[in-house]
Interface confidence: low
């Protein structure tokens, strides 16, 4: 199985080969590179020295190799670089070219979701429900879940509602947001508002959106 | 010598599927993307997607998503392609091809199979 | 999508004279670009990779250039047997795809 590596958008991915190299072979008899699913390379050292003739014009400038640890680093990560790596090593002889060595692995490109915010579209009308909408940027994968939390002094509910979501053309990351029309509980206390995005690793939590209710005015009297 | 077999001619009625196969010799099969292009008459040549049958990813041209499947069979160095839904636009020349070597350059279509004709005819 | 347009669908010459066939990117695909000829009832066969080199074997009077979004495919001379369908190709970025192709009639 490959070697599963998670990496951030805009930073750096290590993509390792580990290769004991027990024979104690040096770098200027062997051919080194990295291709990716596609088989497209994205950086070859041939007999020591990097060379650039086979490597894709996408990952051109966007690696470095550090013949210590036998990693290759791709920078300024892009949501489309995740898949699969592979790190082949070959042995120059006279003969031809013999595989000696080969790794998988497996990148995962993650980003951030900004902290959720909570905006209200309408004013609260008599004290009965609030529109108000609920987003967060600039994210991937996309999200599981997101809702609302409304917390009055005695009770907790939660609103789920459902998400929309948008992915941009060029970086691929994912803007989410869900719009609520909040309606609220027969109580006179103050309430806080909280948005809550679930992602697989994490749960982002917006800050407190406070609202202070009036005394209720007592109902009209009924005329059957 | 690197080498690509593909089935023979094909004649299919509408709405049916038709699958083809294409077998590589004279090199590993796991170690090279294979793709898939149609050819039709007059029209040149369009990129339908490709496998690379080492862990059987695929990617497809958004065109052919859904119609197009691309599978391999790494017991017997084949690749295969089937196509879903046949109306006559599918009436073409369609060739499987091979990348080159990743470590003396990467040409993603330098060796090519014969073509399997396929007729879509009632 | 890139689109790769070629601007003659066929082109006529003699033997022995120099043609160009002209293709045009859509946007920017460096010199990700091939070139392939396609004799009658024949596979495509690749000639020109990385928008200037010539694959093994291809004789020298075929040659490529540019980069960008425009390219140019060259017969220095041309021979009976350069009969063909020529198409150039991006594999900057999926879908990859062709230019229309040029046929090269001899008269």
């Known amino acids: 199985a490959p070697l599963k590596i998670q990496a951030y958008f805009n930073e750096t991915a290590d993509l390792p080969c580990q290769f004991a190299n027990s024979q104690n072979q040096s770098l200027s008899e062997l051919v080194v590179f990295w291709q990716d699913q596609e088989n497209l390379v994205l950086n070859e050292v041939y007999l020591g020295k990097e060379k650039f003739d086979s490597v894709h014009s996408k990952y051109m400038g966007r690696t470095s190799f550090d013949s210590d640890s036998w990693t290759l680093r791709l920078h300024n990560l892009q949501i489309k670089d995740k898949g699969l790596y592979q790190c082949i090593i070959h042995h120059k002889k006279p003969t031809g070219m013999i595989r000696i060595h080969q790794m998988n692995s497996e990148l995962s490109v993650l980003a951030n979701f900004s902290q959720p915010e909570i905006v209200p579209i309408s004013n609260i009308t008599e004290n009965v429900y609030i529109n108000l909408t609920c987003s967060s940027i600039h994210g991937y994968p996309e999200p599981k879940k997101m809702s609302v939390l409304l917390r009055t002094k005695n009770s907790t509910i939660e609103y789920d509602g459902v998400m929309q979501k948008s992915q941009d053309n060029v970086t691929e990351l994912y803007d989410v947001s869900i719009s609520l029309s909040v309606s609220f509980p027969d109580v006179t206390s103050n309430m806080t508002i909280f948005c809550i995005l679930e992602t697989d690793k994490t749960r982002l939590l917006s800050s407190p959106f406070s609202i202070e209710l009036e005394d209720p005015q007592p109902p009209p009297d009924h005329i059957p | 010598e690197v080498q690509l077999q593909q089935s023979g001619p094909e004649l299919v009625k509408p709405g049916t599927s038709v699958k083809m196969s294409c077998k590589a010799s004279g090199y590993t099969f796991t170690s090279y993307v294979i793709h898939w292009v149609k050819e039709k008459p007059g029209q040149g040549l369009e990129w339908i997607g490709y496998i690379n049958p080492y862990h059987d990813v695929t990617k497809y041209n958004e065109k052919f998503k859904g119609r197009a499947t691309l599978t391999s069979d790494k017991s017997s160095s084949t690749a295969y392609m089937e196509l879903s839904s046949l109306t006559s636009e599918d009436s073409a020349v369609y060739y499987c091809?091979?990348?080159?070597?990743?470590?003396?350059?990467?040409?993603?279509?330098?060796?090519w199979g014969q073509g399997t004709l396929v007729t879509v005819s009632a | 999508d890139i689109v790769m347009s070629q601007s003659h669908k066929f082109m006529s010459t003699s033997v022995g004279d120099r043609v160009s066939i002209a293709c045009k990117a859509s946007q920017d695909v460096s010199t990700e670009v091939v070139w392939f000829q396609q004799k009658p009832g024949q596979s495509p066969k690749l000639l020109i990779y990385?928008?200037?080199y010539r694959y093994t074997g291809v004789p020298d009077r075929f040659t490529g250039s540019g980069s960008g979004t425009d390219f140019t495919f060259t017969i220095s001379s041309v021979q009976a047997e350069d009969l063909a369908v020529y198409y150039c190709?991006?594999?900057?970025?999926?879908?990859?795809?062709f230019g229309g192709g040029t046929k090269l009639e001899i008269k």
């Open positions: 990385s928008a200037s």
């Open positions: 091809s091979r990348q080159g070597d990743p470590y003396s350059g990467n040409y993603q279509f330098t060796y």
């Open positions: 190709q991006q594999h900057y970025s999926t879908p990859y795809t």
